[in-house]
Interface confidence: low
Amino acid sequence: GCLTQLYENAFFRGGDVASMYTPNAQYCQMRCTFHPRCLLFSFLPASSINDMEKRFGCFLKDSVTGTLPKVHRTGAVSGHSLKQCGHQISACHRDIYKGVDMRGVNFNVSKVSSVEECQKRCTSNIRCQFFSYATQTFHKAEYRNNCLLKYSPGGTPTAIKVLSNVESGFSLKPCALSEIGCHMNIFQHLAFSDVDVARVLTPDAFVCRTICTYHPNCLFFTFYTNVWKIESQRNVCLLKTSESGTPSSSTPQENTISGYSLLTCKRTLPEPCHSKIYPGVDFGGEELNVTFVKGVNVCQETCTKMIRCQFFTYSLLPEDCKEEKCKCFLRLSMDGSPTRIAYGTQGSSGYSLRLCNTGDNSVCTTKTSTRIVGGTNSSWGEWPWQVSLQVKLTAQRHLCGGSLIGHQWVLTAAHCFDGLPLQDVWRIYSGILNLSDITKDTPFSQIKEIIIHQNYKVSEGNHDIALIKLQAPLNYTEFQKPICLPSKGDTSTIYTNCWVTGWGFSKEKGEIQNILQKVNIPLVTNEECQKRYQDYKITQRMVCAGYKEGGKDACKGDSGGPLVCKHNGMWRLVGITSWGEGCARREQPGVYTKVAEYMDWILEKTQSSDGKAQMQSPA
């Protein structure tokens, strides 16, 4: 999902895919977002390091798990790519950096009266990527008011130096602010000459053009179609540049298509993603995952939601289909483009929509305002252990949350079954994000057995824990997999990154939410919690969480759901949402069943006949 937080004084260790110099962490994050493999980045400001070579260093990183170990480094800033962040994705960077000289190839010098004018000149020059401007107080008089237009092989500075009375910045062409204008024409049967800056495989000239638009040095392109005479060059997209900024020559050539970068378009740029689906085409690449889904659109959505997936092939071969679902091959490559494109197949292929600015709210989770009290929308696969416990009497409704802890086991709160102990009225939905997606055809699990803690009493807060054994085991997928349980009697770990999730009320007298909500809540000591609940006994088998000022909390409908904390890169189930005085009230934290205190009970109840525990433990 979309992760926007930055980590101060932290540096991700390992996983490097590229490095460059950038003036700040935000620009580094943008470069990570647009790099096909980058999921994480670390940035070293000038103040964070003595090594001149590493100052302003931006390190782009990939990770199979989506995370990397963080090491403490004073001044360093780390964070996540903004892939999947919808409208936050932009190559536009307007900031001006004072006291900084961004080095590159100086290809044009002129006198201007302000840094804004210098930026405008860069934006209106087809080859300019960034610029430096010497102010009127620069120490060498002959350089004052100089505007230096620059470029570099990678589009980022070749070095960045701290230099008084110099201001630097980037071209605003990616902001669609260029005065140059663009050529939308696509030229059939025409090949452009000049310098090739990159070569990728694309299914058509339009994908080639979009890649050219977002490549730092591509000004125009030539695409060789799938019927081009030389087989090894079919579907090749050649990204090109020239000294003049336009092709120096063009040659009539059957089965080639040429065109220009659209970076100089005014007001609108193409989205940095490719939404078209190509029937009868297979995209080759490194296998990330294979999953059975219903329909090519669902395959594309699955690829989009799996952040490392770049492109996919949905196979309609009879051997790749089971009933109405067929195999969805999720793939990636070094450059984000297929390594092979095959035609006349029984597949359909396309690209991840992770870089689309618009699209479903399920991909970008920043638009809705009513939620779990003080929370935000979750995204697909973010909390794959979360389940919805629903009761089907005449109508069907969501009553509680729960956590998948094994193929056939769900952990929830005992009070969810108060007055509803009949297992056949319950339906358990896993691997879902939006409750509105549930139709009469959505698969659900039925309950084989409800195991309520033997010491639980209705209307008492103690031992509010229950296990559900499902009638049939669930397969694990990216969207449906278990949460690890804590170690028995885990009291020494200090958890600082804890989250509560659920579809519960967004206010005390609210209603069930459609999109799974998440809220980051700090743990509160039991002593502090007891002070807030003097009429109740807060036992060591409970854990409390909440903000002193209130405003963020679990609420009705979240009961039974998880309180999870991330520690050393691993999520653990620390608590089960149990009770509280109202929702998100000031100085009234939420009270959760402390899972670590019930590990013996959980192990005993989930023990299979062969003596192996049927749930996940981080042991």
Epitope: G295, V296, C321, E324, D360, S362
Partner: antibody, heavy 120, light 107 residues
Framework: EVQLLESGGGLVQPGGSLRLSCAAS????????MGWVRQAPGKGLEWVSW????????LYADSVKGRFTISRDNSKNTLYLQMNSLRAEDTAMYYC?????????????WGQGTMVTVSS | DIQMTQSPSSLSASVGDRVTITCRAS??????LNWYQQKPGKAPKLLIY???TLETGVPSRFSGSGSGTDFTLTITTLQPEDFVIYYC?????????FGQGTKLEIK
Amino acid sequence: EVQLLESGGGLVQPGGSLRLSCAASGFTFSWYYMGWVRQAPGKGLEWVSWIVSSGGLTLYADSVKGRFTISRDNSKNTLYLQMNSLRAEDTAMYYCARTTVTTGDAFDIWGQGTMVTVSS
Amino acid sequence: DIQMTQSPSSLSASVGDRVTITCRASQSISRYLNWYQQKPGKAPKLLIYAASTLETGVPSRFSGSGSGTDFTLTITTLQPEDFVIYYCQQSYSTPYTFGQGTKLEIK
């Protein structure tokens, strides 16, 4: 050539029954989901029923549920719609249509239709 | 059930004009929106599926856009054969529902 050909329509009295057939050719019928869509004279399109490739799952519009049954015989490349307890409001042109996962379950191939008239 | 509302219900235009038909879903249907053309006495024909993908053989003057609840069908440079009825349809969840249709007439 990919083709769907409906048959079995006609005039029937209210309460009566009719069985529509749809013969498929030019594609591997057993791979595809199929459906029926109807259009009352001078009116818009209404989805009636749908069946998965194996025949194991069928879905119906509320207006026909319990009265109509969709089925298929993959060995004969034929789709059927058994219509019982017919009412005047069932009078319509009935189209059989193919839906495919590659088009997000859009109806990409349609038959020419067969007219069903329910009248006394 | 998901309701599909098409507007306008009828539209007058001339050959060579550009027209836009809109379709609104009563709840989000992602991009599972299809457009059909129906000529008098004929079966409907698929024009666009998945909101914006042109069906093979359909002229490029037809285009579709939108996601979530709001969608549009645009026809640039109207041809005489385009003056017929257009329907939108959602294939997001059953029952699959159609819009009431838009009749495109010659001015």
